[in-house]
Interface confidence: low
Amino acid sequence: KPSNEATGNVSHSGMKKEFLHELKAENIKKFLYNFTRTPHLAGTQNNFELAKQIHDQWKEFGLDLVELSHYDVLLSYPNKTHPNYISIINEDGNEIFKTSLSEQPPPGYENISDVVPPYSAFSPQGTPEGDLVYVNYARTEDFFKLEREMKISCSGKIVIARYGKVFRGNMVKNAQLAGAKGMILYSDPADYFVPAVKSYPDGWNLPGGGVQRGNVLNLNGAGDPLTPGYPANEHAYRHELTNAVGLPSIPVHPIGYDDAQKLLEHMGGPAPPDSSWKGGLKVPYNVGPGFAGNFSTQKVKMHIHSYTKVTRIYNVIGTLKGALEPDRYVILGGHRDAWVFGGIDPQSGAAVVHEIVRSFGTLKKKGRRPRRTILFASWDAEEFGLLGSTEWAEEHSRLLQERGVAYINADSSIEGNYTLRVDCTPLMYSLVYNLTKELQSPDEGFEGKSLYDSWKEKSPSPEFIGMPRISKLGSGNDFEVFFQRLGIASGRARYTKNWKTNKVSSYPLYHSVYETYELVVKFYDPTFKYHLTVAQVRGAMVFELANSIVLPFDCQSYAVALKKYADTIYNISMKHPQEMKAYMISFDSLFSAVNNFTDVASKFNQRLQELDKSNPILLRIMNDQLMYLERAFIDPLGLPGRPFYRHIIYAPSSHNKYAGESFPGIYDALFDISSKVNASKAWNEVKRQISIATFTVQAAAETLREVA
């Protein structure tokens, strides 16, 4: 096809300006309003209706093809006729305190009937009764402190932990491993209440009755618990529930800090080990087990009646066909399902995606197609374990691994209004730096300055002077399957808070009923200028990835990152110098492979400068080398015990799904190695993991060599 079909004779930069200029804050605001009128819990009629609406609107916006893609996956709901709660019972078995069954609805939402009460999705049913143990954030190190230093056993106890620091599924896993028979999760004011800010509806803080919903799975990338590795379609073989992946084995329930106060105020046992175990409630934060003094005969009882159910979910998939390279896919995806109204999570992201689709559609209607195909996705059931995106990627994995250029994630656009936050593959570092230099900063005091300028000042890189921070990809969002399983270059961007002055874990109203449209309009982004900036960043990333003649990937940034990660893991290992020597552990091979990668990447970039871009075959060859570089870090065997985490350079931390870990195979082999019973076996596994990492880096380097 003639190249003018791709651009309508408008230059790349002119077309990009037109695309960015078409993005309007007022539209994003309007879309956010529309998407937050009712709850959109996965598997419910409301969320199906919204899928149909988005489907119809994307067609109107001008996409070539829009389809609903459905799967039947395992979801979890509270029992309407048998509510979940926690009680304190006296020695006669009488309930003397019960936690709230629901949150008070926010003003204006009193008559909305389908607000799901707070619950921990996928908790099993059960009514455990016993003594309480306070376990801080329920991190690995918190249980080490309890069990190893304080000699307190959680076996047969109900543990209570404060949300924050790590993914709640990891908290539950740790509690199970410690032998707990039930777990209570609560939001402590120290983590979800910023001093001097009012509670909702008068401010953006969490009120005492507010509760964070969320799933407590440990899927490790499996997707639907009943169909790991394969799409949950009508042909799927489904495991029995007893063999489902990642389900917790103990009842779990979340509460707010008003209810937590009642459970914690009479705790007995030793005082908290240090100030890092003390929250913001007026309670002693004694560890337990059990209550003190006159209250020692009282017990805590959980009443959990939630159920799991195979339920139909719906993704919306929109296609804008590429004019010149229709077999190369750039994907922009974000979820649509919400715990309740989703004012921030996810609809602040979905509204931005909607406006990006509208802008691309406007260009297409003028005859200006992208060079490559763009796929837009509205994912379902993200909140239940990234299910919609994972099932779709499982169904289309063969196409994606052959044709997937990049995946840009688009969940919540804001978690604050201070500065930009970006997590991405090193391949995208220079892309992000370059495009933020071309965008206006929305921040006060940076009028007339670029987004790059405000970002680097407010969030400087810890390694590279004069550059902004870009973080590693972890998980907990829909890029997981694309990056960690399939090895498709991925990135995400949103506006965030000032982490130096604002110590709260997430934004305080995260996953509560108070996460409303009004929260955003009144307190976070009244003019929607931050939403617009995020739309410009996400949109420009997609635009460049879909339209640049040479893919905007920088393999030399990967080389720099690999060197840093190799240094880091070597330093961790060197905390055990005697064992390193005794078991002959050497990182020389890994450093050699990294040096080789650096050399090959440099030569590749040199050839790229000299490339005759008018030769479509040579151009495609080098673009394919760039596209497939991320794929080269995938090990088909996966990481130990985590077959769907296959990226050797990055994986979600085994201790916190949200965080990214570099050289995760080596890191996990080294973790807590000094307490392993069989030291020889443990250090042998370190050696094996070093060899896997070495091979992988070396093999990836080979893909960048001249093809013949």
Epitope: T38, Q45, F48, Y77, T81
Partner: antibody, heavy 123, light 108 residues
Amino acid sequence: QVQLQESGPGLVKPSETLSLTCTVSGASFSSSGYYWGWIRQTPGRGLEWIGTMFYSGATYYNPSLKSRLTLYMDTSKQEFSLRLTSVTAADTAVYYCARHRGPDSGLDAFDLWGQGTLVTVSS
Amino acid sequence: DVVMTQSPATLSLSPGERATLSCRASQSVSSYLAWYQQKPGQAPRLLIYGASTRATGIPARFSGSGSGTEFTLTISSLQSEDFAVYYCQQYNNWPPLTFGGGTKLEIK
């Protein structure tokens, strides 16, 4: 405002198939979020729920009628319909169509009804 | 199936009196219960849902109470237009949705 109107033959012969249609005006199937049901009333058995469907195609049938019953919908015409096969005199009743909120709601009562149509099964 | 039993089958009262109608479920239906009014030649009309919440446009003299298996519809001061047949219906456990046999409220 939203209105429901049943239509179909008033007389059906035994062993034949009873077909009724309910036309919805004033609301869209695909945006309202309601479920659409059929209920019948006989002097002997009182009110009896027949079945319900959602515009996604999800159907819920009374187990006592399931083997003979089909519900289907034409969203373009804003109609939903009932087919009951192998009818007998016991199927003589006033048939109502009605809307309700569906199984994931705590408000699942029939808040709007058609005026009803009498169907007699007789040779 | 959940069987709904209404009592009495017929209730004879005068205008201005208080009417109390009962509905019993064969097993707990929580508060997922509705009440309907039906006049001759008309379709049923929703009065109460959720055991105690009045539907739109229903006068305050109608009230519902109860949960679990025992429910009551009360009409505080009967008006002439209130004489009709009243049905209860459960929607806790379905399919099937089930109705009571009805209580006929007639003028004494």
